[in-house]
């Protein structure tokens, strides 16, 4: 198992959380492993226990402080180690000098709400959660709308190339149930990726007005 296919991937949420996934083919499910964080210019160290998420995959969250506290900056380097117990000792399985702001994945947007809905359009707003003030306006969003009879995967992606926490959906069908999701990504970072999708927001367009002769 030691020389099997291993993966170690971590992301910083830009505030006070580093989430890591460790996978190793052939490793035993009950193997006890942890991630240890050792910053280069901070006095704290942090450890989290890797818990199984699938057959050969484990995950954990390094909680660095209060959710909205800015625990790391663009100049920080955090050495991350995967340590697994082998008998009475811990063995180093993976090491990475992690640059937090090169490996960003923000929290999913929250507080989605319908601001205004009509027969053919709907205005929706949202908020970003636990995002660093360092980004200023350097964020982008993707949104998608689930139409009746379709899947999320079929939904076309709408791209907002700026920090715009609202959208006006148009060309909707009257009196129809829809769902809406949005995700966010900083422009910064070589390995930065999209946040998870927000919780879906369900809404219904207004029925068309009845004609005079009907």
């Amino acid at each position: 198992a030691v020389n099997g296919t291993s993966q170690f991937t971590c992301f910083y949420n830009s505030r006070a959380n580093i989430s890591c996934v460790w996978s190793q083919d052939g490793a035993l499910q009950d193997t006890s492993c942890q991630v240890h964080a050792w910053p280069d210019r901070r006095r704290w160290n942090q450890t989290c226990e890797l818990l199984p998420v699938s057959q050969a995959s484990w995950a954990c969250n390094l909680i660095l402080g209060a959710p909205d506290s800015q625990k790391l900056t663009t100049v920080d380097i955090v050495t991350l180690r995967v340590l697994c117990r082998e008998g009475v000792r811990w063995r180093v399985m993976a090491i990475q000098d992690f640059k937090p702001f090169e490996n960003l994945r923000l929290m999913a947007p929250i507080s989605l709400q319908v601001v205004h809905v009509e027969t053919h359009r709907c205005n929706i707003s949202w908020e970003i959660s636990q995002a660093s003030h360092y980004f200023e306006r350097h964020l982008e969003f993707e949104a998608r709308t689930l139409s009746p009879g379709h899947t999320w995967e079929e939904a076309p992606l709408l791209t907002l190339k700026q920090k715009q926490e609202w959208i006006c959906l148009e060309t909707l069908t009257p009196d129809t149930q829809y769902e809406f999701q949005v995700r966010v990504k900083p422009l910064q970072g070589e390995f930065t990726t999209w946040s998870p999708w927000s919780q879906p927001l369900a809404f219904r367009t207004k029925p068309a007005a009845l004609g005079k002769d009907t």
Partner: nanobody
Framework: EVQLVESGGGLVQAGGSLRLSCAAS????????KAWFRQAPGKEREFVAA????????DYADSVKDRFTITRDNAKNMVYLQMSSLKPEDTAVYYC????????????????????WGQGTQVTVAS
């Protein structure tokens, strides 16, 4: 594109020392890992040592542990392999390699983890 150029190889007596250097140029990565591999005649390429981006983590093959030391100088874009107590079985072509993801460790020693390679430098240890 990335260029890696090794130097410092040569002929040395058993028990002697050599210092290999690897100069990197071209595209840079935010937090790559670099490593040394070697290939003896008629054998497969094998992992020797690896180092994380800031040099805060290292990994060594059992066969060279306590004899070889890998270091790097990011200001000069250099990686070094200090080899001491050399043995005839250390004779090989030594290659410098780069892994953009920056992760090293026992499960990350396979050569297919490394996307960029140098041309190699010959090390011969005479008995």
């Amino acid at each position: 594109e990335v260029q890696l150029v090794e130097s410092g190889g040569g002929l040395v007596q058993a028990g002697g020392s050599l210092r290999l250097s690897c100069a990197a140029s071209g595209r840079t990565f935010s937090s790559d890992a670099k490593a040394w591999f070697r290939q003896a005649p008629g054998k497969e390429r094998e992992f020797v040592a690896a180092i994380t981006w800031a040099g805060r983590g290292t990994d060594y093959a059992d066969s060279v542990k306590d004899r070889f030391t890998i270091t790097r100088d990011n200001a000069k874009n250099m990686v070094y392999l200090q080899m001491s107590s050399l043995k005839p079985e250390d004779t090989a072509v030594y290659y410098c390699a780069l892994n953009p993801t920056g992760v090293i460790g026992p499960g990350f020693r396979n050569s297919n983890r490394y996307d960029y390679w140098g041309q190699g430098t010959q090390v011969t240890v005479a008995s």
